[in-house]
């Protein structure tokens, strides 16, 4: 039994890191393998992650971690029984994929303005709480070409747009994702989408 693709890990910079790897053949990850991990810190202890299958030869492990800080470094040991298959390390702050925003809501009752709000996925004590920026994707269910991205570079989890920038009388969907420039993170997954019917009063034409 050998590791074909070494484990690569990403952290949500809160409490979970996800490591994925591939073996050189079909493997029952949960019965044959264990991933041991330990924070390099005087008061830490070793933990064991039981991997799950992720395709025939692929394995994935969800590591429960202490609250992450920038200096953290974890040692990782992948075992098959008594055999050490791979040894490595992982700095969560260098491989961050933020959590997806939640509770995306479209408020349509604000005088021909659409107000989109969502929740920051981090608690206020987390470093990323004040460092997330967002991208909002709005698209028409009727017209695949009607697809737009709004970059929200301020900290407030909201976006205002004029209803008139979208077509009236048709349904739209929106979703939002996050990233943090300070740690050069990847983008989060998209939030679940929300749907609304866009309608607004056309301004009277002046002749």
């Amino acid at each position: 039994m050998k590791v074909l693709q070494e484990p690569t890990c990403v952290s949500d910079y809160m409490s979970i890191s996800t490591c994925e790897w591939k073996m050189n053949g079909p493997t029952n990850c949960s019965t044959e393998l264990r991933l041991l991990y330990q924070l390099v810190f005087l008061l830490s202890e070793a933990h064991t992650c039981i991997p799950e299958n992720n395709g025939g030869a692929g394995c994935v492990c969800h590591l429960l971690m202490d609250d992450v800080v920038s200096a953290d470094n974890y040692t990782l040991d992948l075992w098959a029984g008594q055999q050490l298959l791979w040894k490595g390390s992982f700095k969560p702050s260098e491989h961050v994929k933020p959590r997806a925003p939640g509770n995306l809501t479209v408020h349509t009752n604000v005088s021909d303005t659409l107000l989109l709000t969502w929740s920051n996925p981090y608690p206020p004590d987390n470093y990323l709480y004040n460092h997330l920026t967002y991208a909002v994707n709005i698209w028409s269910e009727n017209d695949p070409a009607d697809f737009r991205i709004y970059n929200v570079t301020y900290l407030e989890p909201s976006l205002r747009i004029a209803a008139s920038t979208l077509k009236s009388g048709i349904s739209y969907r929106a979703r939002v994702r996050a990233w943090a420039q300070c740690y050069n993170t990847t983008w989060s997954e998209w939030s679940p989408s929300t749907k609304w019917h866009n309608s607004y009063r056309e301004p009277f034409e002046q002749h």
């Epitope: 005087l42 008061l43 830490s44 202890e45 202490d66 800080v69 920038s70």
Partner: antibody, heavy 115, light 109 residues
Framework: EVQLVQSGGGLVHPGGSLRLSCAGS????????MFWVRQAPGKGLEWVSG???????SYADSVKGRFTISRDNAKNSLYLQMNSLRAEDMAVYYC?????????WGQGTLVTVSS | EIVLTQSPGTLSLSPGERATLSCRAS???????LAWYQQKPGQAPRLLIF???SRATGIPDRFSGSGSGTDFTLTISRLEPEDFAVYYC??????????FGQGTKVEIK
């Protein structure tokens, strides 16, 4: 908002015992290492003890064998049991949250050791 | 034991002036594990800088940290009235694992 609220200080005779408490809120207590740091009157800061999320502990040589740090994650609380107290243990004791550094501190509680 | 020596012991300056505080370690310290705190009379310390140069949440940008190895510096670019306090450096490393410098008092001239 992160808060650490301390209780349990007071006056004790040399050789006596005291238990300090620290209640945490505004963060996930169980995922954070916790510490005690003290400051003798007019002096600087001195690390006393720390406890990891899994219960691993460490002590300064000056308190080893006399002080015991513990935590109750269900109650979001940190404790310091101080036995065989000496005059040199008199200080303001702070609980703190952190790891390599201390992000948040309690308000401090004064321990006076005097006959 | 790593000993942190702060200098000067007291710094007498006027508001608006620049303050430069030094922290020297008896052995090399990883910059990832060097922090600075501010303490005012009757108050708990407050984290200013971690990882030698990263500002903690809510700390004004007039505070900056630098250095590596055995020499670290805290700089306050323009002293505000509320900055007059005692400043401590702190390291995490060898036994005992967490040690503080003896402090530098920044007082009004």
């Amino acid at each position: 908002e992160v808060q650490l609220v301390q209780s349990g200080g007071g006056l004790v005779h040399p050789g006596g015992s005291l238990r300090l408490s620290c209640a945490g809120s505004g963060f996930t207590f169980s995922r954070n290492a916790m510490f005690w740091v003290r400051q003798a009157p007019g002096k600087g800061l001195e690390w006393v003890s720390g406890i990891g999320t899994g219960g691993a502990t460490s002590y300064a040589d000056s308190v080893k064998g006399r002080f015991t740090i513990s935590r109750d994650n269900a109650k979001n609380s940190l404790y310091l049991q101080m036995n065989s107290l000496r005059a040199e243990d008199m200080a303001v004791y702070y609980c703190a949250r952190g790891r390599y550094w201390y992000n948040n501190w309690g308000q401090g509680t004064l321990v006076t050791v005097s006959s | 034991e790593i000993v942190l020596t702060q200098s000067p012991g007291t710094l007498s300056l006027s508001p608006g002036e620049r303050a430069t505080l030094s922290c020297r370690a008896s052995q090399s310290v990883s910059s990832s594990y060097l922090a600075w705190y501010q303490q005012k009379p009757g108050q708990a310390p407050r984290l200013l800088i971690f990882g030698a140069s990263s500002r903690a949440t809510g700390i004004p940008d007039r505070f900056s940290g630098s250095g590596s190895g055995t020499d670290f510096t805290l700089t306050i670019s323009r002293l505000e009235p509320e900055d007059f306090a005692v400043y401590y450096c702190q390291q995490y490393g060898s036994s005992p694992p967490w040690t503080f410098g003896q402090g530098t008092k920044v007082e009004i001239k």
